[in-house]
Amino acid sequence: KFSKQSWGLENEALIVRCPRQGKPSYTVDWYYSQTNKSIPTQERNRVFASGQLLKFLPAAVADSGIYTCIVRSPTFNRTGYANVTIYKKQSDCNVPDYLMYSTVSGSEKNSKIYCPTIDLYNWTAPLEWFKNCQALQGSRYRAHKSFLVIDNVMTEDAGDYTCKFIHNENGANYSVTATRSFTVKDEQGFSLFPVIGAPAQNEIKEVEIGKNANLTCSACFGKGTQFLAAVLWQLNGTKITDFGEPRIQQEEGQNQSFSNGLACLDMVLRIADVKEEDLLLQYDCLALNLHGLRRHTVRLSRKNPIDHHS
């Protein structure tokens, strides 16, 4: 569960995040598992550790292997494993399956291809995009932030899309490429403004201090497959991943269910060992798609112990 596959190409930058997360203030130690040798933190090294990140600048085939990260806090240690594989660059245009990130789908109405892993890097716009090794040109293609938007998608737009960007580290530039497949689906359904089914707006959720609590954010977005829909939790206006409290996690993956033909998504927020300070936070369930954003706020309150009357 706490092991993650990462891959890259030789002579490109590769940055890997520790699969175990903690507060920014926690120490993270990295080791090369085969030799149990500590990864240095000095940036002059080609491979060095920087908190939760392990950086290969640039990567070499010999760097392949399993790396261990240990998140250390005053009260616990958490261990994760990064399985890193560095491949030689291909001479031809074909991108082998093992270098592919997850496939994304699009339709005539909405198509968005995110550049995989880009949020780990220090990059500046614009991104360069290629399809089957050809640079994309024409007004139908729009590079926006970390994704590509294709207007008026056609079946011929299916294929392998590669994003290319430059990672900057202390004034030195390193190239990074990432490829994923894009498939085009016939859009039979329709998309609406998100409708949040749970939680209710301004809901007060009773919790017990020291126990675990779950909050579910559930929203529907229309009929049929929805490509640009998401539900997520925020704590005091901050994404869970950026909040840095390991006790509070979003359940990975979003379940797309079809009740009454509606496309709905769920995201569960798990709070372990509820603490007093958790009651002071604002929990926002956000549901968003192409049409807009909907938000329901939840606050936690302490469950009063049941009075026992004689």
């Epitope: 005091n236 206006g237 926002d284 049409h291 954003l293």
Partner: antibody
Framework: QVQLVQSGAEVKKPGSSVKVSCKAS????????ISWVRQAPGQGLEWMGG????????NYAQSFQGRVTITADESTSTAYMELSSLRSEDTAVYYC??????????WGQGTTVTVSS | EIVMTQSPATLSVSPGERATLSCRAS??????LAWYQQKPGQAPRLLIY???TRATGIPARFSGSGSGTEFTLTISSLQSEDFAVYYC????????FGQGTKLEIK
């Protein structure tokens, strides 16, 4: 307190572009959308489009499609509206507004854009 | 797009009396309807959302009702500061506003 502060008045020539900014403060910027609404002299309110800062996704009214670009910068809690190919009919007060589940609960003070040759 | 039609265009009422403003949608917008008040030289102010819920700080004399395609804003006892232009707005789909009702002193 919660507020939206817009950039100052602009005078533009026909055919040019204008970019208006809207700085948010006093609330969690990424938890809400920002919409832009304009009002021509003596006329009603017209929704131009909106942006979701957390995703960067923008949505535009059909009548402005291709001519307006709405963006948001999370790092500065600022939204922007750029309108191109200006014509005299674009002379109006342009408002940004916080989108609270579809209703606009907080408004900027408005930016007057005058298009004149 | 959903067309919002407000009536009347102008409404003349005496202070202390009740004012009733109407808004009709070209198709059902459920309860996704808001009302705004705008005074000259000022930005609009949200009065009602969800067809009937008063926004923060809005006096109890303002009330909203309706669902589907027919909506009403009622001001129970008009104060001098209530004379302004009122707009309805639907947000079931891409937002659209009504053309406004001007509430003037009789």
């Amino acid at each position: 307190q919660v507020q939206l502060v817009q950039s100052g008045a602009e005078v533009k020539k026909p055919g040019s572009s204008v970019k208006v900014s809207c700085k948010a403060s006093g609330y969690f910027f990424t938890s809400y959308g920002i919409s832009w609404v304009r009002q021509a002299p003596g006329q009603g309110l017209e929704w131009m489009g909106g942006v979701i800062p957390i995703s960067g996704t923008a949505n535009y009214a059909q009548s402005f499609q291709g001519r307006v670009t709405i963006t948001a910068d999370e790092s500065t809690s600022t939204a922007y509206m750029e309108l191109s190919s200006l014509r005299s009919e674009d002379t109006a007060v342009y408002y940004c507004a916080r989108d609270e589940n579809g209703a606009f609960d907080i408004w900027g003070q408005g930016t007057t854009v005058t298009v004149s040759s | 797009e959903i067309v919002m039609t407000q009536s009347p265009a102008t409404l003349s009422v005496s202070p202390g009396e009740r004012a009733t403003l109407s808004c009709r949608a070209s198709q059902s917008v459920s309860s996704y309807l808001a009302w705004y008040q705008q005074k000259p030289g000022q930005a609009p102010r949200l009065l009602i959302y969800g067809a009937s819920t008063r926004a923060t700080g809005i006096p109890a004399r303002f009330s909203g009702s309706g669902s589907g395609t027919e909506f009403t804003l009622t001001i129970s006892s008009l104060q001098s500061e209530d004379f302004a232009v009122y707009y309805c707005q639907q947000y079931d789909n891409r937002p659209t506003f009504g053309q406004g009702t001007k509430l003037e002193i009789k």
